[in-house]
């Protein structure tokens, strides 16, 4: 017993006078309390508690249910224990099987034995599996068996507690060991698509996926700069021990103008956070943007290739697309295709393949598309560059050389006159009239040019030449003239290519 | 004898929260998992959630997560459970139960919480 | 989660009959051979009492007319011979993962 000074309350003493008691099954627990100020007994087993008011604790047929610690209190709060053991061969254990771990803890096996005097107390496999090498244990007969620095790996473990009594060992009931994993991470997150576009009226439901060892991790969506609770649906899963999935589903069933914006999918556990967002757009109407990916005025020399292509937005998704020319539907000749795969994806691109345009080819091209809501149109203008072509070359009634030239761009028209048989006309003759004529063909055809000069200021034999010419190339035709006395004769023009 | 008391019956409003306590006594209150189990009226059991022992981890059901809190006061063996953003799904009876030998063993006798406008 | 599902809903009896509820879960409650599937009593405006515990063991104090069996996904709750205090709900519960779950109930009502 504790020894105490003089005047100050001093703890209750117990008879008997030992801390620990061993009785047999079905004989007499007599346990006196002495105190003044005696207060209560309390009975201790597997951390439930009983009390007695009396001073004498008496249980006539122990039980091994009675093994335990006797605490006797005063009314100073002072006490003193004793632990009786109810040696019962039938029953070596108390058991509480609940048995929890925390990742990196020490965690209790509560199985304290009725008998301090059996040996080799500790902890066995079932179905006489070993235990895990690293797997350390402190045996205590009167709590139980402290494993430590429990791991990941022992979840589902199945133990007894074991002992030998008179040479055999005895095993208890089965303790299935089940281990919260500490967390070593930040969840991981992810979403079903990174933006959605909807029109009003239609649902909008996006899933969150998050993925971390046990369920105890918190999630939830929440919306960008508002307080809002969002509805959420959760499915979840266990793939196998620390491998827990949830998907967290929101869904807004008639989405409105106004819940546009961002979404947020949080996740945190007692390591950290971890989001993801999605953003969501909601179009009162559908539309379809198109943006030409070359001018819309073209120029293409005769006989080369053009590309006309255009890349549109369209939501909701394009129904119809065609590329006309001179009320003349394309049946072929172009492609149509998204500009990606990604589900998500609202952008096209459409080709219109032009080749070995001619020169009666230019014109306005127009591609259309449609969907659901609206429909939309582009035009392109396309102006084929032609080398000018000599239409016609005429000495007229009246005197005049007349030389008309055809092309794209607007050819100029250039005169020389060559004396006698030289072959090089470098004297350059003034034009008299020059015209630009309206063209029978459509408007993005050729232009024409006439000029005119008067025949009556060449003197001498020789050569007249007309000179077409613009960007592409150039034509020249020749009048050839020779003088008989005083009368001049036109001999049958020609045209000569000069490239 | 393992005895759990809870607190009296509650009428809240919709949006508000409630905390209900649960006073254990009869057993070493650190060496427990402490579970909460609501009651829908005329509807079944449902398991809101655990607070462990020792360590006073928490594991809830995702169906309340970021709504409810359990926590423990070791200094008077008395365990609460709070929920807030009450809606009128929430009125129940609210169960405290004792995890003792792998089952719930002991049980609070039950607070009601209305919830109504 | 693990679902369990109760069969009856609801039943009508005798005293003196004997009566027979199952419980099916989604997924096995078995870890090595130890089922976490428990039997709960349920009267109305009281607590749930525990009848059986672990599938097959009698709580202490509950009489031994009522019984508990199965393994894995299939579980059992038989009263032999009913009494007049045996009219109740009946809950199944599992604890093998979280978040435990319980079963819809089995009303048993006097016939």
């Known amino acids: 017993q504790p020894s105490v000074s003089p005047g100050e309350p001093s703890p209750p003493s117990i008879h008997p006078g030992k801390s620990d008691l061993i009785v047999r099954v079905g004989d007499e627990i007599r346990l006196l309390c002495t105190d003044p100020g005696f207060v209560k007994w309390t009975f201790e087993i597997l951390d439930e508690t009983n009390e007695n008011k009396q001073n004498e604790w008496i249980t006539e047929k122990a039980e091994a249910t009675n093994t335990g610690k006797y605490t006797c209190t005063n009314k100073h709060g002072l006490s003193n224990s004793i632990y009786v053991f109810v040696r019962d061969p039938a029953k070596l254990f108390l058991v509480d099987r609940s048995l929890y771990g925390k990742e990196d803890n020490d965690t209790l096996v509560r199985c304290p034995l009725t008998d301090p005097e059996v040996t080799n107390y500790s902890l066995k496999g079932c179905q006489g599996k070993p235990l895990p090498k690293d797997l350390r244990f402190i045996p205590d007969p009167k709590a139980g068996i402290m494993i430590k620095s429990v791991k990941r790996a022992y979840h589902r473990l199945c133990l007894h507690c074991s002992v030998d009594q008179e040479g055999k060992s005895v095993l208890s009931e089965k303790f299935i060991l089940k281990v919260r994993p500490a967390f070593k991470a930040v969840p991981v997150v992810s979403v079903s698509k990174a933006s959605y576009l909807l029109r009003e009226g239609e649902e909008f439901t996006v899933t969150c996926t998050i993925k971390d060892v046990s369920s105890s991790v918190y999630s939830t969506w929440k919306r960008e700069n508002s307080q809002t609770k969002l509805q959420e649906k959760y499915n979840s899963w266990h793939h196998g021990d620390f491998n827990y999935e949830r998907q967290a589903t929101l869904t807004i069933s008639s989405a409105r103008v106004n819940d546009s914006g961002v979404f947020m999918c949080y996740a945190n556990n007692t390591f950290g956070s971890a989001n993801v967002t999605t953003t969501l757009e909601v179009v009162d109407k559908g539309f379809i943007n198109i943006f030409p990916m070359i001018n819309t005025t073209v120029f293409v020399n005769d006989g080369e290739n053009v590309d006309l292509i255009v890349e549109y937005e369209a939501f909701p998704k394009p129904e119809h697309q065609q590329w006309i020319y001179m009320n003349r539907t394309f049946t072929d000749k172009w492609e149509d295709y998204p500009k990606s795969e990604n589900e998500s994806n609202i952008r096209y691109v459409s080709e219109l393949h032009l080749t070995r345009l001619k020169g009666t080819e230019g014109g306005t091209y127009t591609f259309l598309v449609s969907n659901s809501d609206v429909n939309a149109a582009i035009a392109f203008n396309v102006y084929v560059n032609t080398k000018p072509e000599i239409l016609t070359y005429d000495r007229l009634v009246n005197g005049m050389l007349q030389c008309v030239a055809a092309g794209f761009p607007e050819p100029t028209i250039d005169w020389y006159f060559c004396p006698g048989t030289e072959q090089r006309c470098s004297a350059s003759v003034l034009p008299v009239d020059v015209q630009t004529l309206n063209s029978s063909g459509p408007p993005f055809g050729k232009l024409v040019v006439q000029s005119s000069i008067d025949s009556s200021a060449f003197k001498h034999n020789g050569t007249v030449e007309c000179k077409a010419y613009n960007d592409v190339g150039k034509t020249s035709a020749y009048f050839n003239f020779a003088f008989k006395g005083n009368n001049k004769e036109q001999i049958h023009p020609h045209t000569l290519f000069t490239p | 004898q393992v005895q759990l008391v809870q607190s009296g019956a509650e009428v809240k409003k919709p949006g508000a929260s409630v905390k209900v306590s649960c006073k254990a006594s009869?057993?070493?209150?650190?060496?427990?998992?402490m579970h909460w189990v609501r009651q829908a009226p005329g509807q079944g059991l449902e398991w809101m959630g655990v607070?462990?022992?020792?360590?006073?981890?928490?594991s809830y059901n995702q169906k309340f997560k970021g709504r409810v809190t359990m926590t423990t006061d070791t200094s008077t063996s008395t365990a609460y459970m709070e929920l807030r953003s009450l809606t009128s799904d929430d009125t129940a009876v609210y169960y405290c139960?004792?995890?003792?030998?792998?089952?719930?063993?002991?049980w609070g006798q039950g607070t009601l919480v209305t919830v109504s406008a | 989660e693990i679902v369990l599902t109760q069969s009856p809903s609801s039943l009508s009896a005798s005293v003196g009959d004997r009566v027979t509820i199952t419980c099916r879960a989604s997924?096995?409650?078995?870890?090595?051979?130890?089922?976490?599937m428990h039997w709960y009593q349920q009267k109305p405006g009281k607590a749930p009492k525990l009848l059986i515990y672990l599938a097959s063991n009698l709580e202490s104090g509950v009489p031994s007319r009522f019984s508990g069996s199965g393994s894995g996904t299939d579980f059992t709750l038989t009263i032999s011979s009913l009494q007049p205090e045996d009219f109740a709900t009946y809950y199944c519960q599992q604890n093998n993962e979280e978040p435990y779950t319980f079963g819809q109930g089995t009303k048993l009502e006097i016939k």
């Open positions: 997924e096995s409650v078995d870890i090595y051979g130890e089922s976490f």
């Open positions: 607070i462990y022992s020792g360590s006073g981890d928490t």
């Open positions: 139960a004792r995890e003792r030998d792998t089952r719930f063993g002991n």
């Open positions: 009869g057993y070493t209150f650190t060496s427990y998992n």
